[in-house]
């Protein structure tokens, strides 16, 4: 009896426990199943988001594979397009400066010739035959040979031919062609089916070759720079004028003294009106020449290097785009399927281990 009673008690306890478990199962399982099913929506949303974002996910993957091989060469060509524009500007400045310099230096020659004529006339004064004035007059006469302009300023050749060449190069919009290159890359995320097949149009390649042949690397920069370092006149005209004034002041008052002082004043005016503008022009010329020299230095080698990079990028795009797309599409597909595989594994684990 005791044993039976004990077993019945135990059975009731077990039955209670089982009923409790059954009640728990009946009460909680629907919630757990609901939770498991709810996780499907998260997985589905993740997959749908990737499908909806095929441009940035798949396209972005393709773009990330292509970009490192193409962007650097496009950047280089873009900087060369800027260099072409800067070259045109420098050549225009240089050409107009040279033409101004030519007229300015002829004008200086003319003015100096006139003042020398005037000084020679002044020195014909009878007072120049009398000591001690004769010594002053001789000293002035000997210094007249210094009143010359630099003839080489007039002989600097213009750069019309080089400017024409660069203007011809600029007829092709290299910047625009580079933009097309960037654009066709940037289009990839939106239009995977329309990948770029050309990095830069053939016109861009020819444009670079034409620029390399425009002649700015063969210009005789040294001859221009040599002149920018020279004085427009054979002597510092202000010093000459002050010296002439001092010599005039050592003479007795009269016509000779007055005419020499007038000539000294004329020389100061020549310095102000003729020499200073030439010095300004020479400074502008120097700056333009330096810009051109910088661009022209190693131009052919630089263009050759860019064209080689362009060939490499073009070959990469021609030969690898299809395989990149296939690889990235497979990767993209695997990513989406992976979301569902992960979900099913999690369900199996949840039901077998947790529920």
């Amino acid at each position: 009896n005791h044993q039976v009673r004990t077993r019945i008690k135990r059975s009731r306890k077990l039955a209670d426990s089982n009923f409790k478990d059954l009640r728990t199962l009946l009460n909680e399982t629907p919630e757990q199943i609901k939770y498991i099913l709810a996780q499907y929506n998260t997985t589905k949303d993740k997959a749908f988001t990737d499908l909806n974002s095929i441009n940035s996910v798949l396209g972005g993957g393709i773009l990330d594979r292509l970009r490192p091989n193409i962007i650097p060469v496009l950047d280089e060509i873009k900087s060369m397009a800027t260099a072409i524009k800067e070259t045109k500007e420098a050549l225009e400045n240089m050409n107009s400066t040279l033409k101004s310099l030519h007229q300015q230096s002829t004008q200086l020659s003319s003015s100096l010739t006139s003042v020398k004529t005037s000084l020679r006339s002044s020195l014909n004064d009878p007072l120049c035959l009398v000591h001690p004035s004769s010594e002053t007059c001789n000293s002035i006469r000997l210094s007249l040979s210094q009143l010359n302009s630099n003839p080489e300023l007039r002989q600097l050749p213009p750069v019309d031919a080089e400017l024409d060449n660069v203007n011809n190069v600029l007829r092709t919009d290299l910047d625009g062609l580079v933009q097309q290159g960037y654009q066709s890359l940037n289009d990839i995320p939106d239009r995977v089916q329309r990948q770029t097949t050309t990095v830069v149009a053939a016109a861009g390649r020819k444009n670079l070759q034409d620029f390399a042949a425009c002649g700015i690397d063969r210009m005789n920069y040294d001859s221009y720079l040599a002149q920018t370092g020279k004085s427009p006149a054979g002597v510092n005209l202000l010093s000459f004028a002050y010296d002439l004034e001092a010599k005039a002041n050592s003479l007795p008052p009269g016509n000779l003294r007055n005419s020499l002082k007038r000539d000294a004043q004329t020389i100061k005016t020549i310095h102000q009106q003729r020499v200073l503008p030439i010095e300004q022009s020479l400074s502008t010329l120097y700056q333009s020449v330096k810009i051109l020299q910088r661009t022209g230095n190693g131009l052919l080698e630089r263009v050759t290097r860019i064209l080689a990079s362009l060939d490499f990028a073009q070959n990469f795009i021609t030969n690898n785009t299809s395989s990149v797309i296939i690889e990235e599409t497979k990767k993209y597909g695997r990513t989406i399927i992976g979301y569902f595989e992960h979900y099913l594994q999690w369900i199996e684990f949840s039901i077998s281990e947790k529920v």
């Epitope: 107009s96 033409k99 030519h102 007229q103 020659s109 003319s110 003839p151 002989q155």
Partner: antibody, heavy 117, light 106 residues
Framework: EVKLVESGPELKKPGETVKISCKAS????????MHWVNQAPGKGLKWMGW????????SYADDFKGRFAFSLETSASTAYLQINNLKNEDTATYFC??????????WGQGTTLTVSS | DIVLSQSPAIMSASPGEKVTISCSAS?????MYWYQQKPGSSPKPWIY???NLASGVPARFSGSGSGTSYSLTISSMEAEDAATYYC?????????FGAGTKLELK
């Protein structure tokens, strides 16, 4: 193509005034100075002077100071040579010429001036 | 002013003959320029910077010289070369011309 076209022949009396024109085309007029050269019948070339086409400032050779005047009409790309109080010895052909560097690279066809009473 | 003296003033040459015209400057110049002029025409630039032929000038022409002494040479005279030739300097202001050398065909 650079061209300098001068006005036609002139027949004048002593004491009169003449104005010869030189119209430039094919380049930017203010880029190059304009020179005038005189050639008396059967004689050589004589430089008369020049005008700065940027500033309009003229310069004359010693033998051509006084009665001779250079001027410009920049908008018309034209240079002028005016000779006042004409004398018989002014009878000559007058050439305009542009100069870049240190020689005269383009010349007008010349204007023949005859001064006779 | 720099004076340019040309010699000879007049000369004649037969076709195929070598011709030399000289130009002497009263003081040293860096370059000499030469012009050709035919009757009734304007002068044409012929040789610039001493030895460079202007556009369209036949290769039988050449120029040489330095300092105060310059020359124009025709290696083989042709009928069309008969003209007056002027030397000119612009090294020193004002520019000056030589008196000219009249070259006739013999």
């Amino acid at each position: 193509e650079v061209k300098l076209v001068e006005s036609g022949p002139e027949l004048k009396k002593p004491g009169e005034t003449v104005k010869i024109s030189c119209k430039a085309s094919g380049y930017t007029f203010t880029d190059y100075s304009m020179h005038w050269v005189n050639q008396a019948p059967g004689k050589g070339l004589k430089w008369m002077g020049w005008i700065n086409t940027e500033t309009g400032e003229p310069s004359y050779a010693d033998d051509f100071k006084g009665r001779f005047a250079f001027s410009l009409e920049t908008s018309a790309s034209t240079a002028y040579l005016q000779i006042n109080n004409l004398k018989n010895e002014d009878t000559a052909t007058y050439f305009c010429a542009t100069d870049y560097g240190d020689y005269f690279d383009y010349w007008g066809q010349g204007t023949t001036l005859t001064v006779s009473s | 002013d720099i004076v340019l003296s040309q010699s000879p003033a007049i000369m004649s040459a037969s076709p195929g003959e070598k011709v030399t015209i000289s130009c002497s400057a009263s003081s040293s110049v860096s370059y000499m320029y030469w012009y050709q002029q035919k009757p009734g025409s304007s002068p044409k630039p012929w040789i610039y910077r001493t030895s460079n032929l202007a556009s369209g000038v036949p290769a039988r022409f050449s120029g040489s010289g330095s300092g105060t002494s310059y020359s124009l040479t025709i290696s083989s005279m042709e009928a069309e070369d008969a003209a007056t030739y002027y030397c000119q300097q612009y090294h020193s202001y004002p520019p000056t011309f030589g008196a000219g050398t009249k070259l006739e065909l013999k």
